[in-house]
Every structure is written in C-alpha cells, then in structure tokens.
Amino acid sequence: IVLRPSRVHNSEENTMRALTLKDILNGTFSYKTFFPNWISGQEYLHQSADNNIVLYNIETGQSYTILSNRTMKSVNASNYGLSPDRQFVYLESDYSKLWRYSYTATYYIYDLSNGEFVRGNELPRPIQYLCWSPVGSKLAYVYQNNIYLKQRPGDPPFQITFNGRENKIFNGIPDWVYEEEMLATKYALWWSPNGKFLAYAEFNDTDIPVIAYSYYGDEQYPRTINIPYPKAGAKNPVVRIFIIDTTYPAYVGPQEVPVPAMIASSDYYFSWLTWVTDERVCLQWLKRVQNVSVLSICDFREDWQTWDCPKTQEHIEESRTGWAGGFFVSTPVFSYDAISYYKIFSDKDGYKHIHYIKDTVENAIQITSGKWEAINIFRVTQDSLFYSSNEFEEYPGRRNIYRISIGSYPPSKKCVTCHLRKERCQYYTASFSDYAKYYALVCYGPGIPISTLHDGRTDQEIKILEENKELENALKNIQLPKEEIKKLEVDEITLWYKMILPPQFDRSKKYPLLIQVYGGPCSQSVRSVFAVNWISYLASKEGMVIALVDGRGTAFQGDKLLYAVYRKLGVYEVEDQITAVRKFIEMGFIDEKRIAIWGWSYGGYVSSLALASGTGLFKCGIAVAPVSSWEYYASVYTERFMGLPTKDDNLEHYKNSTVMARAEYFRNVDYLLIHGTADDNVHFQNSAQIAKALVNAQVDFQAMWYSDQNHGLSGLSTNHLYTHMTHFLKQCFSLSD
C-alpha cells in the first residue's frame, strides 16, 4: 500500500464538515437578494435590517428614514406601500394567506405630513387587495369581492361594484383558476398610467363545479372548504372587463370592454391587460382551445364615454404546432408612439424571439434571432430595449441581460452581464428605475448570489447592494457537492442535465443515483443557480449522485422540444428521464441497483409513471402531491396542453395517461406516496385514487398524508416530510442511519 498525503490531513480540511439535514431544515445556508422598491428614476425604498423604511437617492448619495420601525411595530406591519405623491403610506398587517398569491390583510394609512394614522373613514377589514393610483394618492381596494375607490385616504369610499359574492362573483380579484393558471397575481384590477381610469375583471363562477374537502382543524366537526374549481372539460368562469373613470366614477359608471368577435364566438379566457396611455388600453384574450390568442388595442371614446376596440387594432397570434405562447402568452411592451410594441413569440424556426409590431403581426420585424430564446423584455426606453436570454455560450439554463440600442440603425446588441462575474454569475434578473436611469442586477448563481446597482446609461456598477458575505463565511467550512451542467445527445434530442456529485466524488466508484424530476410543460430544472437544499445534503452527507434532466416539453430550447408533449402528457417526459438514466449508467459511476426518482406536483406524476414504466431501472421512488389523472386537474392548465377530455377530442389519451392505469407495474418498486389533505391545487383526490388503484391491485406501497396542509407542505410539515423522505431513500439505498 502506497500512502499518499491526503487533503484530509490538511488543517483546513479537518474543520470541513458535510451538510446536515438540520442545516437544510433550519435554512442555515439561505441567501438574500436585494430588489430596490423604485419610486423614481433615481430613488428607491428599502426595508433595513432593523425594519425602518429607508429612502435612498442614488445621485445625492443621501438616505433617510421615511417610516420608523416604531410606527411599523405599532400596527405589527409586515409590508408597506408609499403613495406616489409621497404623502401617505399604507401599512399591511394581519396577513392571512389564501391561495398561491392571494391573501387578506388589515390596512392602516399613515399620513407622513403630520406623522399620524388617518382617522375617520378607516378601511374595512379584512381587505383582499389594496393599491395606490400611479399618481397622487387615490386608493382602490377590494373588500368582500367588491371594488371601492377613495379619492383621498380620509375620504368616504365610492363603491364601484355591488354584485360581488363569495365563491360566486369576483370583482377586481381573480377566482382560483385565474389566480393560479392565468394571471399569476392576487389582483385583477389595473390603474391607467396617470390614474384617470381603473380597469377591472369580473369573474362569474356561478356555474363552476365546486371542489370540497375537509379541513380538520381542532373542532369537533371538520370544516368543509368549497372552491369553485373547473377541472378539465368542466364549465369555466365567465370573465368580463370593465373600466371606470375614477375622476367622475358616478357619471357613466363602469363601461364594459368589448371582446373581439373571433374570441367571443366560443368559450374564452381573458389573459392580461396592459395600459398604454390613459386613453388606450391593450387586452389579451385566448380561446378555450388555447392555440389562438388575440391582442386587442382599445381607445377611450370621449363621445361614447366607453372603449372602442377596432378590428384594425386586433392582432392574432396562433400556434399550429402546440399552444399559444410558452407557459403564458407573452405580454406586449409598448414603445413611445403608444401604438407599436415589442413582444416575444415564436419565429419561423420555432424559437421564441422579440418581434416589433407596428401595424400587423404578419409584418412584424424580428429583433432577436438564433437557436436560443429571448425570455423576458424588462424595459423599453426611447433608445434601448433591455431583455434576458439564454444565448451566451449556448447554455439554455443561463440568463443574461442584454441591451439593444433601438435609437440607432442598425440596432446594436450588447450583453450587459455576460462578463461581469463570469464564474459566479450566469443567471440574472434585473429591476429598472423609471426611464431605466438605473437598474439593479440580481445574480442567482451558480456562485453565491449577489445584487448590484448600475447606471442605466453606461452600465457601470455603482455599488453592491447585497453580496451574502455571511453566507460565504458560513460555507467556508462546508463540504459542498460539486455540480456540473452538461448535455446528452439522443436521437436528435438534446437532454441537458445537472449532476450534483458528492464532495469526494471518484469516477471509479459506484454511487446511488437519485433523479429529481419536475418535467412540466415549459418548465426548466437545469439552471445555473445557487442552491443549498435537500439534494445538496444528500450528495454532501449521504454520498448520493443527484441528477436533474430537462427532457421534451421543457422550455427555452425551441418549440420542437417544447411542443413535443402537446396532447400527450406523460409520455415523452417519462421516456426522456429513463433515457438519461441509461446514459448515466453508461458513465460507469452509478450503482444500477440503487437508482431512485422523486418529484413534486407534476414531478410526482412523472416520477410515478417512471416507477411504473416497467423498465426495472428504479428500485424506489417518491411522489409528493402528484397529479394522477389529467381529468382531476384545472381546466386552464390541463387543456392548454391536452385539449378536452371528450370523445371527439383527446379523451383517449386522458384515460391512457393516468397513474392508476399502471397500478400493476408498481409491484416491483418501493413507492412512497405523499399528499396534503388540504391541497387546493392538486387535490388529495389524486393520491386517494392512486392508493385505491394500488390496493385494488394488491400492490404494497408506503404513504404519508399531511393533515390540513396544502400543495406546499409548509411549516413543521416540511421538516417531517424531508426527514421521512430521507429515511425512505437511505433505506432504499441501504445507507446506515
């Protein structure tokens, strides 16, 4: 035996330790980001560590506290909002979560001019949504599903809508399905740029079937939670858009915005609203069969006191190979002429790129192009367009920020972030001040996240806003796993993967493999971001190799990959995970008798189908809150990718793609099924049906439910969940406790 000096004898190495599960559950290695709350071109607000609300002026370098932590504490405020005229601040307390984005709260208005809370005509409680007008200090709020307007915080409210009813009519806030699957917001009202008009959506859920589940609580009898929730093929909400003149709200009242005729001819959705000017608004509509989207630009007609949406200002976006858009249909970013706009949609080669639309979509000018995708348009100024893409070095899991000079011809492109901190930062987002005078860059990795402030004209870094020094120091004595992002080329498909390897990884050894999968349409798991999480612990402490694979159906690599799963969910996503596992085995360091797969939500569906694929590849696996049949999931999401569960549409694949149909195939794997009983999103029904099918097939399996927990399994349930899954995997991989 030849003894070689080992790094273990290094004094620094002796102090190094592996990650523990406790580290993960305690959030010991969580990072901070800094997003300025911009209030002008050169000023932003930020909540300091000691909870003061501080105003920073970049140009003078001065900062001062506009609201003390004492005032915040006096009403137990957890959030705030400054009125644009800087006279008032709303303070938000008694936060009570509802669904993913929605919550109710109590609001207090603080008068900055006299240092007192506004008394008289106080706001009712709890409020579902509240916001300032973009100019001045008008308030719009939603209470008990109705919208109210205050010209000033101390004024009596003007009631705009009167038909709001719990679970029936929603004004200014979305119902469950619009919140989760269409708007991705807690609000459905929009002020015009100068606060002259207020647009809002009304959702009528009267005819929607209701999902009902027990909430056990502490009482003698459980409560029943009822949510109007349209599952695939069911009756959908009926949406109408109204606009009211907030200066004279009683004059003509709310005016309905007409729906384009080609949309109104069958079931449809409203997808977003973008104000262009105070008297021009842009609405986006979508057919229920979500391959046709119409963007409609409407003008206020003072002579009609309502909104005119001429056919000449309707722009149609249609997909012939899949659904319209990516996850959502993109929204337009209007240019200064208030009629032309920039928008991301598929080019002729099937890559999502920025286009400039002046008159018709057919005559759109393509601004970006290549075998990569433009992902987000951050800001359009008179001379620049800022966007993010995954172009740089052809890594789809990166995000860099680019600037295109649109003021000059031909337009020139500059990557703002590509070479800033190249090793540390490859995945950015940005936040711009008014007129893009300044912007903050937030880098998410792959190194430790860092937030910086930049000059909008020169792109020069002005200062570091947050560099996570404490985290950096805390990680100095931690043996973090190694991460690599690479690709597999299989049958003309590129499968990008991220592999997380144990700290002392040795290619000549064999390691247990855990596949972590999500795999939902238009998702991306293989991203160059920093994370110290459960799988980091499994690699660091338990010596597992973890792999994440982006297969067909995933995003930002072109429509061929994205739309491959159209109308056949549950097929190629699973195939591609299996293909990748086979390739990993060929690499020589995977113990093929110890391979597991796990996923949550859509990932739970994919992991279940992979386990039941009959390949014999997987020893065990975990499904957390899985979908088990697409007939059980929300109409808006499901039908986007699957069409309708009707005989003349796609019922056959709805039936073929269930987990229950494969119950027999679970016989030779160890399966852990986990679900929260109060899951409003992927209903417990999904796991109940899997369990029933497995029992009926006399297949043994393990299960865990979390009483009164939703789709996120938060709080103490999180600790229990990850501890439980860790035990399961260690047992599966014959790892000692």
């Epitope: 004279y248 004059y251 309905e256 007409p258 729906v259 005729a261 109104a264 007609r301 003072e302 002579d303 009609w304 006191q305 309502t306 005119d308 949406c309």
Partner: antibody, heavy 120, light 111 residues
C-alpha cells in the same frame, strides 16, 4: 329644460375672424360634449369638432385644423367657436349642439344657429 | 373618413303613406355593442332635430311612427304613416369614427 342659445348673426370680411358663443342651461355643463356643426346655404351638415367642458378634451375636423379654436367658460356655461382666416366658402349657419348622454355621438339639443356671412 | 350616401335624394309621398329612407356607409359603423348611426329631421330655417339614435332608439318626445333599423353599412329610417308636419329634410349621421360625417340628406316632399 335644456337650452342652447347662440350669439347673433355676423358679417365678416375675408381674412377676418369670427367668434360664436353658445350659452348652455338646464343641465350640468361640464358633463356633456358640445359639438359645432355648420351648414352652408342650401347644403348639408358638416361636423367641425367638439369640446368637452369637463375634461378640456377637444377634437377638430382635419380640414379646419389650424383655423378653428373651441373653448369653454365653465363659470358662465358658455362654449365658444372661433374661426380664423375666413373665406367666402365659410359662409354658413353655425350650430352648437349638445352631445346626448346615452347617444354616444348623437346630438340631442341644438342651438338656434348663427349665420356668418363672409363677404368683401 | 366614412362617407354616408342617402337615397333617394328626394322622395315624393302623400300624407298617410309609408316612407322608407336609406343610408349606406362606406364602411361598417357597428361594433359588437352598438350601431353608431343617428337620424335627424330639419325643417327650413330651423336647427336639426334628433329622431333616432344608435340606429334604432327613439329619442324622447318623438312620435312612434318614426323607427330606425339596420346594422353594419345599411340603415333605414321608416315613417309608418306620414303626417303633414313630417315633410322636411332628413339626415343620417355616423359617430363610429372621427370625423363625424352626415349624409347629404333626403328631401321628403308632399306629392
């Protein structure tokens, strides 16, 4: 009841200006658009433009742009229409008309008309 | 701009008869909600008087022998039984687009 009372007839020389007034009563002046319409002798009606006394919004017919100015005085509930650089073909009866509340472009009350004669 | 063409130019009828006046627009003046066409009556030396607004709505105070119909580009004003005071010039007007435009008028005269 709603009434629109216009100023009296005017005779002007070519190149001169004329300012016609229209005093409104019987309704809230700031809540309705005032249109101006003219009618040349023996001819049809021609829309000249509108003004909204409440918002200050003004729209002019393109062919008159640059020569016409519409104003209002909310304190006296009076609308004014001034036409400059008069030509002989501006000879017409000039009407002010109130924009109907529900008509969305219909004119429900009209002034009695003001005859403007442009002659050298 | 939208051009309105009225026909006939002159219509000669007797009291008690039915009058049908036509107005054709060079492009549609309708939306999904309304047809932005209005009808006026004008007698010599008087200001026009609103009869019908938004294609088919009778203005208050106007006798119900007057009615309006049509959508898109073709509109009709009908007077079911002519009274002596109905003989006048009739104008159609659109407010679908700016500039507002009027038809050239139809003169309804006693036969």
């Amino acid at each position: 009841q709603v009434q629109l009372v216009q100023s009296g007839a005017e005779v002007k020389k070519p190149g001169a200006s004329v300012k016609v007034s229209c005093k409104a009563s019987g309704y809230t002046f700031t809540e309705a658009i005032i249109h101006w319409v003219r009618q040349a002798p023996g001819q049809g009606l021609e829309w000249m433009g509108w003004i909204h006394p409440g918002s200050g919004s003004i729209k002019y017919a393109q062919k008159l742009q640059g020569r016409v100015t519409m104003t209002t005085d909310t304190s006296t509930s009076t609308a004014y229409m001034e036409l400059r650089s008069l030509r002989s073909d501006d000879t017409a009866v000039y009407y002010c008309a109130r924009h109907g509340g529900t008509g969305r472009g219909a004119m429900d009350y009209w002034g009695q008309g003001t005859l403007v004669t442009v002659s050298s | 701009e939208i051009v309105l063409t009225q026909s006939p130019g002159t219509l000669s009828l007797s009291p008690g008869e039915r009058a049908t006046l036509s107005c054709r627009a060079s492009q549609s003046v309708s939306t999904s909600a309304y047809s932005y066409m209005h009808w006026y009556q004008q007698k010599p030396g008087q200001a026009p008087r609103l009869l019908i607004y938004l294609a088919s709505n009778l203005e208050s105070g106007i006798p119900d022998r007057f009615s309006g119909s049509g959508s898109g580009t073709d509109f009709t004003l009908t007077i079911s039984r002519l009274e002596p005071e109905d003989f006048a010039v009739y104008y159609c007007q659109q407010s679908r687009e700016l500039p507002y435009t009027f038809g050239q008028g139809t003169k309804l005269e006693i036969k």
